[in-house]
Amino acid sequence: ITQQDLAPQQRAAPQQKRSSPSEGLCPPGHHISEDGRDCISCKYGQDYSTHWNDLLFCLRCTRCDSGEVELSPCTTTRNTVCQCEEGTFREEDSPEMCRKCRTGCPRGMVKVGDCTPWSDIECVHKESGTKHSGEVPAVEETVTSSPGTPASPCSLSG
């Protein structure tokens, strides 16, 4: 399909800044116009684009879920940055939700790592020093964990 095959129709929208594409691409914070002759700015706080692009539409800003805090708002060139609230973390396996950190380690294990927004508490066997697999134990000791200090945030896209 050729680019000429696209015949866009845009309904009236708020005034959006326009500039000209460079070699068919628009700068971050913009998307390409209907005829490919203009770059149209994304709508601040609503959508964004992060790279030079030939996108028909800007990407929708992420809205932080309940259980998340907004570290930085969405701009026309950067998506919202959300982070799990204290006492919860996001795993790579299930990035769509924050899970509660365990409050302590299983018997025979000691805590060597705090709960952070991107990891559960870390437990190792007292003797061997090997890490616990991460399953929630049936019985927990009263070794409690305080939430870790936020460091690098977790960013979710569109």
Epitope: I1, Q3, A13, G24, D54, L55, F57, R60, S157, G158
Partner: nanobody
């Protein structure tokens, strides 16, 4: 994960109308741009129409402009394609797609999901 299921296809005479629907499940598609593509027998899949996440900007292939209308209902998680003045050359399997955006020319950008398609046949 998003699942898309098209419906509304069928056989119609030239000049007739059909309305295709695409129901999304598994996860809301309100964050995604959505589009319709089609594949005629023995041909490559081609872009038909797309609209942005808010539904306020639409694009159409030149071949369907003025005859087809794309729309979405985010509350129902559903995309529509109203097709009128149908021609024999509109005969194809029509696919629904959800993507973070679409590039000029129609290629999906970023995460994208596809339905299984619904057959539209236009013949006298």
């Amino acid at each position: 994960e998003v699942q898309l299921l098209e419906s509304g296809g069928g056989e119609v005479q030239p000049g007739g109308s059909l309305r295709l629907s695409c129901a999304a499940s598994g996860r809301t598609v309100s964050n995604y741009a959505m589009g319709w593509f089609r594949q005629a027998p023995g041909k490559d899949r081609e872009f038909v129409s797309a609209l942005n996440w808010g539904g306020d900007t639409t694009y159409y292939a030149e071949s369907v402009k003025g005859r087809f209308t794309i729309s979405r209902d985010n509350a129902k998680n559903t995309l529509y394609l109203q097709m009128s003045s149908l021609r024999a050359e509109d005969t194809a399997v029509y696919y629904c797609a959800a993507a973070q955006s679409f590039r000029r020319g129609g290629a999906p950008y970023g995460d994208n999901y596809w339905g299984q398609g619904t057959l539209v046949t236009v013949k006298p």
